[in-house]
């Protein structure tokens, strides 16, 4: 089952996906697609990187983080209800059947008629490594928690642990890190 992420109509949506390059600049091809991950690659590709750069993208989809450090989280600009659905992040680690693939479910909610300011809770003690999105207009104001690095064997249980956690709502924009090499 997919981990669920939420955004409101008109906001920017954030779908986390990370890996740790084996060495600085030693990048791994990554693709993002609309729809669940197929057997290989991505379906309906919205963005892809190669060993050097972002080499394919479509409008409204971009990488806000430092992809050269393995932050390949996808930002979708000014979302509409049509952006709801499953997204695939595929990290194409070289080798025999080494790909890591993640299906992320994006739920778009109608915009609030009278948005009230919400109090941000401080989770710095529990998750000291915080990642705040860079400003791209007033729509994107949330603070995003970045989980500590974990190894591959922990990936599969991460989603369930988060979903069952009392912090799940506050951490729904958190991403796991894959360490390569």
């Amino acid at each position: 089952s997919e981990v669920e992420y939420r955004a409101e109509v008109g906001q920017n949506a954030y779908l986390p996906c990370f890996y740790t390059p084996a060495a600085p600049g030693n990048l791994v091809p990554v693709c993002w697609g609309k729809g669940a991950c197929p057997v290989f690659e991505c379906g309906n590709v919205v963005l892809r990187t190669d060993e050097r750069d972002v080499n394919y993208w479509t409008s409204r989809y971009w990488l806000n983080g430092d992809f050269r450090k393995g932050d390949v989280s996808l930002t979708i600009e000014n979302v509409t209800l049509a952006d709801s659905g499953i997204y695939c992040c595929r990290i194409q680690i070289p080798g025999i059947m080494n790909d890591e693939k993640f299906n992320l479910k994006l739920v778009i909610k109608p915009a609030k008629v009278t948005p009230a300011p919400t109090r941000q809770r401080d989770f710095t003690a529990a998750f000291p490594r915080m990642l705040t999105t860079r400003g791209h207009g007033p729509a994107e104001t949330q603070t995003l928690g970045s989980l500590p690095d974990i190894n591959l064997t922990q990936i599969s249980t991460l989603a369930n642990e988060l979903r069952d956690s009392r912090l799940a709502n506050d951490l729904r924009d958190s991403g796991a890190t894959i360490r390569i090499g």
Epitope: A36, V39, G43, N44, Q92, P94, G95, D99
Partner: antibody, heavy 121, light 107 residues
Framework: EVMLMESGGGLVKLGGSLKLSCAAS????????MSWVRQTPEKRLEWVAT????????YYLDSVKDRFTISRDNAKNTLYLQMSSLNSEDTAVYYC??????????????WGQGTSVTVSS | SIVMTQTPKFMSTSVGDRVSVTCKAS??????VAWYQQKPGQSPKPLIY???TRHTGVPARFTGSGSGTDFTLTISNVQSEDLAEYFC?????????FGAGTKLELK
């Protein structure tokens, strides 16, 4: 015109080895994933292996992963399948096929004419 | 492995008829289903991908439909050149698997 031409098939003894080649033309070979698919004498189709455009990522059917090796030479526009420890279940016509992937992964949009492999005891 | 159960195995038809071939996946495969046509002595030729998108040059009488686990290939107004074997394939998860085929024959 897209062309895929397999070669290297033949009669081989049980436990023997064979190397298949697929010469590609009419498209930018290095811009496509490539696959091997086989068709048994009973006409069943079975995916065997796939390799990414750069050759960096490789995928195998479980029953062949320790015996077959898929590779490619983008400079020569050629795809290969090295087969070893062959058994009777490997008897089939082997096709190479092209897999577009860049904006949308699509499996096997062009196929070669096939090369026949017969494993005899 | 995901099993693609294709029915029927054989189908007799006449020119001008409308025929349907179905494939049922043993697990959810979204719309990651392709259809191929194979004429005797030839290699398979792609017809449909993403369950319903026709490949370039494929006549409009071939239509694919379905999602999840149930998929259909329909040939409306069958022509003599359509007499062939048809295979479905899922490409949702590894290994990529094919149906056993449906042979379309003349009555």
């Amino acid at each position: 015109e897209v062309m895929l031409m397999e070669s290297g098939g033949g009669l081989v003894k049980l436990g023997g080895s064979l190397k298949l080649s697929c010469a590609a033309s009419g498209f930018t070979f290095s811009s496509y994933y490539m696959s091997w698919v086989r068709q048994t004498p009973e006409k069943r189709l079975e995916w065997v292996a796939t390799i990414s455009n750069s050759g960096g990522s490789i995928y195998y059917l479980d029953s062949v992963k320790d015996r077959f090796t898929i590779s490619r030479d983008n400079a020569k526009n050629t795809l290969y399948l090295q087969m070893s420890s062959l058994n009777s279940e490997d008897t089939a016509v082997y096709y190479c096929a092209r897999d577009p992937y860049y904006s949308n992964y699509v499996p096997m949009d062009y196929w070669g004419q096939g090369t026949s492999v017969t494993v005899s005891s | 492995s995901i099993v693609m159960t294709q029915t029927p195995k054989f189908m007799s038809t006449s020119v001008g008829d409308r025929v349907s071939v179905t494939c049922k996946a043993s697990q959810y495969v979204d719309t990651y289903v392709a259809w191929y046509q194979q004429k005797p002595g030839q290699s398979p030729k792609p017809l449909i991908y993403s369950a319903s998108t026709r490949h370039t040059g494929v006549p409009a009488r071939f239509t694919g439909s379905g999602s999840g686990t149930d998929f259909t290939l329909t040939i409306s107004n069958v022509q003599s050149e359509d007499l062939a074997e048809y295979f479905c394939a899922q490409y949702s998860s590894s290994p990529l698997t094919f149906g056993a085929g449906t042979k379309l024959e003349l009555k």
